[in-house]
């Protein structure tokens, strides 16, 4: 990783997962160690992401375990890269009227999608569900993200930095809190409200503002309602 990683100044140090969702299923975007990007029906260590907001709605997305940036080539294929290229690895984030998020390449205009087709983003368009994303807090115990390299000597602070180059596994305060009116807590399994209805156990939890800084409606997204 370059020392000037754009992620190190992230406004929110927490891990999140981006997932697509229909009424009955959900896929979490995951970036594998080899750079392959696909979806999983559940949170995995490879779907734990950091999202850093930049100016003008741009975001940088990184897989914590793969240590790769989410990038897009000129054909619209998404992949994980150790090298941060501002042209290929920054995405424009936009929230649709339905509360879902879309990400597209300002360079190539294609949408980030878990579907195989490559579609250009057009303002006002209604993208397919596999190109619309929601976000969830990480629910995987942080211990699963620790993969220390065996050492003969006592572990030093340097070893810690090797295991966690992005400094995301140490709790960090969110700089801009969400509005007080916006509950950031996950509904409990015993919650009987319609919002807790989640027969597949894949979409539990409210929308969280992964791109901290919003104070208006953008800072407090609706719950996704699934049957």
């Amino acid at each position: 990783y370059p020392n000037a990683s754009p992620l190190l100044g992230s406004s929110w140090g927490g891990l999140i997962h981006l997932y697509t969702a229909t009424a009955r299923n959900s896929y979490h975007l995951q970036i594998h160690k080899n750079g392959h990007v696909d979806g999983a029906p559940h949170q995995t260590i490879y779907s734990a992401l950091m999202i850093r907001s930049e100016d003008a709605g741009f975001v940088v997305i990184t897989g914590v375990m793969s240590r790769r940036y989410l990038c897009m080539d000129f054909r619209g294929n998404i992949f994980g890269s150790h090298y941060f290229d501002p042209e290929n690895c920054r995405f424009q984030h936009q929230t649709l009227e339905n509360g879902y998020d879309v990400y597209h390449s300002p360079q190539y205009h294609f949408l980030v999608s878990l579907g195989r087709a490559k579609r250009a983003f057009l303002p006002g368009m209604n993208p397919p569900p596999y190109s619309q994303f929601l976000s969830r807090r990480n629910e995987i115990p942080l211990i699963h993200f620790n993969t220390p390299i065996p050492r003969r000597h006592t572990r030093s602070a340097e070893d810690d930095s090797e295991r966690d180059p992005l400094n995301v596994l140490k709790p960090r305060a969110r700089m801009t809190p969400a509005p007080a009116s916006c509950s950031q807590e996950l509904p409990s399994a015993e919650d009987n409200s319609p919002m807790a209805s989640d027969p597949l156990g894949v979409v539990r939890g409210g929308r969280v503002n992964t791109h901290a800084g919003g104070t208006g409606p953008e800072g407090c997204r609706p719950f996704a309602k699934f049957i």
């Epitope: 209604n126 027969p199 156990g201």
Partner: antibody, heavy 117, light 106 residues
């Protein structure tokens, strides 16, 4: 290569239950939802339900609520669909199909279930 | 729930003909539409995903188009092995199938 191999044909009496299996191979079983679809003789395709392979959670079409039970065994990469209180109109070919985000990309060969007294 | 209607329900055609099948959704489904081909006694086979993307290994004479509510499957030059039943399916909200279109020999 991806393969979904289903159990053999069954003949059942009305009121009985049937359990059909679908063994997956050639991919990471827990990375894809599995669906069940049925087709009555001479009729179209009817979606029955979906199972999350990692959690085992399911969601069924309203028509089958209370009668269909889907389970999975991750150790053998197998999903099961049990249909209870069988009636003659349940006579059909039952298919499992793998979900690939934007399509059902692989299907089992089908299991014929005949309900007859 | 979103309803899908297909037309025609059946058609007779000859080898070499251009065949067009339409699928209409009761509400907008973006491009989340899939086409399958099914032959008697066989499982459905994926032809087109995301309304217009050809599945790997499917002959290029098959093509899909449309977005929103109206979709089309076209076979540019019908071959003997193409006589089958064709189903559309929406993945926008649930996983409903259309009623099917049977293509038989004239």
């Amino acid at each position: 290569q991806v393969q979904l191999v289903q159990s053999g044909a069954e003949v059942k009496k009305p009121g009985a239950s049937v359990k059909v299996s679908c063994k997956a191979s050639g991919y990471t079983f827990t990375n894809h939802y599995m669906h069940w679809v049925r087709q009555a003789p001479g009729q179209g395709l009817e979606w029955m339900g979906i199972i999350n392979p990692i959690s085992g959670s399911t969601s069924n079409a309203q028509k089958f609520q209370g009668r269909v039970t889907m389970t999975r065994d991750t150790s053998t990469s197998t999903v099961y669909m049990e249909l209870s209180s069988l009636r003659s109109e349940d006579t059909a070919v039952y298919y499992c199909a793998r979900d690939y985000v934007d399509a059902f990309d692989f299907w089992g060969q089908g299991t014929m279930v005949t309900v007859s007294s | 729930a979103i309803q899908l209607t297909q037309s025609p329900s059946s058609l007779s055609a000859s080898v070499g003909d251009r065949v067009t099948i339409t699928c209409r959704a009761s509400q907008g489904i973006s491009s989340a539409l899939v086409w399958y081909q099914q032959k008697p006694g066989k499982a459905p086979k994926l032809l087109i995903y995301d309304a217009s993307s050809l599945e790997s290994g499917v002959p290029s004479r098959f093509s899909g188009s449309g977005s929103g509510t109206d979709f089309t499957l076209t076979i540019s030059s019908l071959q003997p092995e193409d006589f089958a039943t064709y189903y559309c399916q929406q993945l926008y909200d649930d996983f409903d199938f259309g009623p099917g279109t049977k293509v038989d020999i004239k």
